[in-house]
């Protein structure tokens, strides 16, 4: 093809020419190309009008092209270019007009390009620029040059992993002249020693990220005090898991936060035991979102009912016991992967709509009732990957629930009553791998709106699937894999008119029967892989519903003998439905073991007696 | 397949091969070398990714003396405000990082352990690299 050795991803639009040892821009790519990836080619030098042949370009990736020189007008003619990526080029010479002609550029990535200063970076005319990423460079001064006043659309400025040590009032002077309240600024991984008090006074930012910046606690404390007067929608403070500088931590380091106006606050990776931190929390009482990630925290009883938090996130923290959580305004609580408190205790969260309590190894003495959470507004509840959860109440007061996940927790008392009877609005239910033994046909009664039911990895009395789905008239997805099933009721699926996907894989079925699927007019996917299917259990195999598009019978134990000839022929007749048909192999007899079922030619003669 | 030696410890010998077509060079150092009976140390990685690292996860396929364990998925980078600094690494950017590790050992039986690490990243998801680690465990060696 004309574009080779490049790869045509979307004809006439997208071409990938990555790592092809090109020394120059290829000339066999269509004029109409919009996305061009030339990364990892030794281009080394970009002269004027280098891309004249591609006037329609919108995205140009020049990562790791060993570019050392970019001449005036190198990108001239690229008036539609919106993204230019220059990551990993050891640029030594950048002409003043290097970026001229880029009248639509919105994203410029100049990460790891040996950039030593923003002052000499010739981008002042790029009025459309929204995102400037100059991370991983050699920039020492945080002074935002005068030309920034032209960049009125700038939303993201990434200066992380540079060499900035000091921030002075004059550095941010230009921000006072422009209404950039939407600017997100990332200064992480700069060795900051000093922020002059007043430097951020009356400056508004959308997001400020300061992670792994400070070598010791006193520096952190004075620098946070230096942020006084800043109004920021989201502030992210702390460290990275693999970039730890602070040996210890105490709450006084964060006292300066009281002098900021913050809407959302996130603290990550601080090795400390935050104890008695009510003063700090009081400073942050009016934020709408509060996150602690990987922070050792003894107790959070200091959270006040009156805090205005609407979203609280506690992830991978250590607690002495499950915290007392009583918060009037909270709408979302994410409490995941925490260590310490092993037993859940009631929370009082009257506005709560979203609750994720997954991956904590918690035991629940009872579940689930409005009284456990103090709310009747709950729509989303994730209790997955916990310990023993004893089902003692059928969700009284939690009738608004739409999403419920118990996977990989150990559910007790599931077959004693209709646990889900109140949940007429539930759309998604996952009880996979919950040690549930279905011994009660009313287990799913009440789930009138349910669309997705995942119950893989459980078991059934006598390994028989009874008529337990009678209420689930809106079900579209059902996973019954790994349930040790051997037989099913012929009417098990009779009410599931909307079912589209049915996973019966990894069970112990020895024969295939199409009869139970006759009432599934919407069925598109049926997976019977990893069973022990040898044959069909009746002579007359009916057709599957006409809607069926994918039938998976791989990794079964097909008996490729004459007595099963009609079944094997039937399988061949379903050829257009079969998924990975080449993995359907004979198990018996031994001389045919491993042979693909579809390639068999079984000619059997009837013995006349 | 060329084997790249990583290190030897008192109870393990670790090496890897590439299990993808690309075989983009990756440098791995472990100090001190992992002891299966339990150890802590630093894993140093030097790598130039061929795609953005954001939303990185590993698929782990572990084989113990030719018995295959179920696939494990380990999410490393979720996409914003991530735990690790390398989650923000872009295609073509040098990743030169040290990650501390510690684990309490469980009693491993003597033998050969294989761990295929499929690194998937980006949106749309594609393979970043694939390494197959060979760990030979000699519980009683000095």
């Amino acid at each position: 093809e004309s574009w080779e050795p490049c790869v045509e991803v979307v004809p006439n639009i997208t071409y990938q020419c990555m790592e092809l040892k090109f020394y120059k821009i290829p000339d066999n790519i269509p004029f109409s190309t919009k996305n061009l990836d030339l990364s990892f080619n030794p281009l080394r030098h970009l002269g004027s009008y280098s891309f004249l042949r591609f006037p329609e370009l919108q995205v140009l990736d020049l990562s790791r092209c060993e570019i050392q020189t970019i001449e005036d007008g190198a990108y001239q003619s690229l008036s539609h270019l919106s993204t230019l990526i220059l990551t990993g080029n050891p640029i030594q010479s950048l002409a003043l007009g290097a970026f001229s002609g880029l009248s639509s550029l919105q994203k410029l990535v100049a990460v790891e390009t040996n950039l030593a200063s923003l002052e000499n970076f010739p981008i002042g005319h790029l009025k459309t620029l929204k995102e400037l990423n100059v991370a991983h460079n050699l920039i020492q001064s945080f002074k935002l040059p005068e030309y920034f006043s032209n960049l009125t659309n700038l939303e993201h400025l990434d200066l992380s992993s540079n060499k900035i040590q000091n921030i002075y009032c004059k550095d941010l002077q230009v921000l006072h002249q422009m209404p950039l309240s939407n600017l997100s600024l990332d200064l992480s991984l700069n060795p900051i020693n000093f922020i002059q008090p007043g430097a951020f006074k009356e400056i508004r930012l959308h997001k400020l990220t300061l992670r792994s910046n400070f070598d010791d606690l006193n520096v952190m404390k004075t620098c946070i005090q230096g942020l006084a007067g800043l109004e920021v929608h989201r502030l992210v403070l702390g460290e990275f898991r693999n970039e730890r500088n602070l040996e210890e931590f105490d709450k006084s380091s964060l006292e300066g936060l009281c002098n900021l106006t913050i809407e959302e606050f996130r603290l990550t990776y601080l090795d400390c035991y935050l104890d008695n931190i009510i003063d700090l929390f009081n400073c942050l009482a009016n934020v709408s979102s509060f996150s602690l990630v990987s922070v050792n925290i003894k107790r959070v009883e200091d959270f006040s009912y009156n805090f205005r938090w609407q979203h609280l996130e506690l992830v991978n923290c250590k607690f002495e016991q499950f915290p007392t959580l009583e918060l009037k305004s909270l709408k979302r609580l994410t409490f995941t992967a925490n260590k310490g408190g092993n037993a859940f205790s009631e929370v009082d969260l009257p506005s709560l709509e979203f609750l994720d309590l997954s991956r904590n190894g918690l035991s629940f003495k009872g579940c689930c009732s409005q009284s456990d959470f103090g709310t009747t507004s709950l729509k989303y509840l994730d209790l997955s990957f916990n310990d023993v959860i004893t089902m003692s109440s059928n969700f009284l007061g939690l009738e608004q629930l739409e999403h419920l996940d118990f996977q990989h927790s150990n559910l007790k008392q599931m077959s004693q009553f209709s646990v889900f009877l109140s949940l007429r609005n539930l759309i998604y239910l996952d009880i996979s791998h919950t040690h549930t033994r279905v011994a009660f046909n009313g287990i799913f009664d009440g789930l009138l709106s349910l669309k997705v039911l995942k119950m893989a990895g459980n078991s059934f009395q006598e390994n028989f699937l009874p008529d337990i789905f009678t209420d689930l008239k809106n079900l579209t997805f059902l996973d019954l894999s790994q349930c040790q099933l051997e037989q099913l009721s012929p009417t098990a699926f009779d009410t599931l008119n909307k079912l589209q996907v049915l996973n019966m894989s990894h069970n112990n079925f020895f024969s295939l029967d199409t009869f139970p699927y006759k009432c599934l007019p919407s069925l598109q996917v049926l997976d019977y892989s990893l069973n022990h299917i040898m044959t069909s259990n009746n002579q007359e195999l009916q057709h599957f519903p006409s809607s069926l598009a994918f039938l998976n019978l791989t990794q079964n134990d097909f008996a490729c003998t004459c007595e099963h000839q009609s079944f094997l022929q039937w399988i061949k007749d379903q050829r257009q439905l079969l998924v990975e048909a080449e993995r359907m192999e004979c198990a018996t007899p031994s001389d045919k073991q491993g042979m693909p079922v579809l390639s068999l030619n079984i000619t059997c003669q009837m013995n006349k007696t | 397949q060329k084997h790249y030696w990583v290190c030897n410890s008192s109870d393990a010998s670790i090496s890897y091969t590439y299990c993808d077509k690309m075989q983009y060079p990756i440098s791995i150092n472990v100090n001190p070398c992992i002891k299966l009976k339990g150890s802590r140390g630093l894993l140093h990685i030097f790598y130039i990714p061929r795609r953005d690292v954001k939303q990185l996860y590993f698929n782990l396929y572990i084989t113990v003396n030719s018995m295959t364990l179920p696939k494990r998925k380990e999410v490393i980078c979720r996409g914003s405000d991530d735990d690790y600094s390398f989650c923000r690494a872009l295609k073509g950017e040098t990743v030169n990082t040290t990650v501390s590790f510690s684990f309490k050992g469980i009693k491993f039986s003597k033998g050969k352990y294989k761990c295929v690490v499929e690194a998937i990243s980006g949106s749309p998801e594609e393979m970043l690299f694939c390494l197959e680690f060979d760990i030979i465990h000699q519980p009683n060696s000095n």
């Epitope: 009583e326 009631e346 003692s392 | -």
Partner: antibody, heavy 118, light 107 residues
Framework: QVQLQESGPGLVKPSDTLSLTCAVS?????????WHWIRQPPGKGLEWMGY???????DFNPSLKTRITISRDTSKNQFSLKLSSVTAVDTAVYYC???????????WGQGTLVTVSS | EIVLTQSPDFQSVTPKEKVTITCRAS??????LHWYQQKPDQSPKLLIK???HAISGVPSRFSGSGSGTDFTLTINSLEAEDAATYYC?????????FGGGTKVEIK
Amino acid sequence: QVQLQESGPGLVKPSDTLSLTCAVSGYSITGGYSWHWIRQPPGKGLEWMGYIHYSGYTDFNPSLKTRITISRDTSKNQFSLKLSSVTAVDTAVYYCARKDSGKWLPYWGQGTLVTVSS
Amino acid sequence: EIVLTQSPDFQSVTPKEKVTITCRASQSISDHLHWYQQKPDQSPKLLIKYASHAISGVPSRFSGSGSGTDFTLTINSLEAEDAATYYCQQGHSFPLTFGGGTKVEIK
């Protein structure tokens, strides 16, 4: 509207076991919440004794732990208090109550006076 | 356990006067403190939860404040029907504990 009603003997002999029952109407005791006993000696303040959770789990005031039992009869929608080895200091008005999700008590029975005397 | 100390034990007040009752906790309990009113021969009635949140149906003359260890219940303009004993209760941790009570009498 939830209503609670205590019942039981008004007079108990020293060293005997005090037994009280709380009948609940308007809400199932297995449907949610925890169900508490509080007592008040004549002319004195309130003392929390213990509770039974809707799941059947119980917890007690450490000062009474060796003598107290709280159980329930779900078919009758009632829960009971047993306090063994009583003495005169156990003379009090005994209240049953329902705790809300937070640790506060919005619903109380009207109380029943139990006198310990020979 | 957390000890709650109420003061005064007794208060005799004329109608329309302002009444202030204080409750001090032996350790910080954030705002996990609740107030009850108990009239003679009646069971306690919840007035205020979480230090300052009035329960619906409670007259607006009752208000609460405080956080940490020091809390106050205020009756802004005392009425004859307010003659009762008032108790604070901490909901910070089990065992639940009550203050000793403050008896308010109408002069």
